[in-house]
Amino acid sequence: LIIGFGISGRHSITVTTVASAGNIGEDGILSCTFEPDIKLSDIVIQWLKEGVLGLVHEFKEGKDELSEQDEMFRGRTAVFADQVIVGNASLRLKNVQLTDAGTYKCYIITSKGKGNANLEYKTGAFSMPEVNVDYNASSETLRCEAPRWFPQPTVVWASQVDQGANFSEVSNTSFELNSENVTMKVVSVLYNVTINNTYSCMIENDIAKATGDIKVTESEIKRRSHLQLLNSKAS
């Protein structure tokens, strides 16, 4: 969490941002809130990106003002116009690109004053893993698959029964480049699994950590998946 304050001229206002991550090819949110104003026409929101020649987005007098928007963001940005009046300056970024990563500044002007706060935005690819029993294998085998990851993650297997066990010798992980030549499909196979046990396939890079669990008993198979972004710090 980053909290910024205005410095000169009028009074300063508090602006708060939250570091976040974007999943390439999908839409992302750059979060920013500020002390609200009673008149929408008095609010100016500027989003800037470090090292970029134009603006990321500008909203003033109740509407977008995009004459100085940088071409790398053309047609890809929007604020939540109906929420600006209550202090929400968050930016929706469409079709997140790898090159959208960097330091952004949310700069606010209201009748009360000015303020800004920076946020770090990471980009990559992350997806939920699915763990299945591989019935084609000669021995009891589990197969963990996740369709889109970038940068290349690490994959670790764990077991509820054999806690602390190292499964690296009885597992095999491969990374297959997807058609867009950036993200990769992750496939990890765990051999010699035992029944009545819960196994976890944990995939992690510097952006996200995802876990796929599978519980195999003689009568049923239960699955559960979980994904957590690693860098959501507020400023």
């Epitope: 970029v52 603006l55 940088d70 790398m72 090159t99």
Partner: antibody, heavy 122, light 107 residues
Framework: EVQLLESGGGLVQPGGSLRLSCAAS????????MSWVRQAPGKGLEWVSA????????YYADSVKGRFTISRDNSKNTLYLQMNSLRAEDTAVYYC???????????????WGQGTLVTVSS | DIQMTQSPSSLSASVGDRVTITCRAS??????LAWHQQKPGKAPKLLIY???SLESGVPSRFSGSGSGTDFTLTISSLQPEDFATYYC?????????FGQGTKVEIK
Amino acid sequence: EVQLLESGGGLVQPGGSLRLSCAASGFTFSSYAMSWVRQAPGKGLEWVSAISGGGGSTYYADSVKGRFTISRDNSKNTLYLQMNSLRAEDTAVYYCARDIQWFGESTLFDYWGQGTLVTVSS
Amino acid sequence: DIQMTQSPSSLSASVGDRVTITCRASQSTRSWLAWHQQKPGKAPKLLIYKASSLESGVPSRFSGSGSGTDFTLTISSLQPEDFATYYCQQYGSYSRTFGQGTKVEIK
């Protein structure tokens, strides 16, 4: 101390290619856009190209569009200008300059290299 | 692209004179204008940015004004080291454009 050091200039025939480099030090290179500016002998300054800090955006003057390519390697703190299909009118001293950090807020072109001479002649 | 036109192209002045150089943009560049000084055989040096902000270390005899399309660089009292060529530069669009330059010579 901020330093920019260009290299790679020289004599090249019309239609030929050349790659200029600019080694940067003394500042956080990836935080700044960078530009190339040229100056023909006895003439004024002409902006050639710029690139955003992360390298995701590139910008060119009409006179070089389609022939020149700007790039950067932030791990090496180095800016490049690949010049293809060179013409006599591309003869100039080429400067690299530190461009903007934050749009509308910061200085730009506050540091320049010493320049490297490119001569296009048969 | 925005075109920048400087006037005059050259001028002769004496030490102590007040010198004014103007720069006109073909379309509004708001306040996104810089002024540079260049001496023969040297790289340019930034004097003014954002139309009127003085770059750190630049003497206060240099000042800039204007917004939109019309801008002015003023040297309040010309010093011997100020004889050089001065360029305006817009940065209000993704391109950056320089004026053709104004050479300040000794009278």
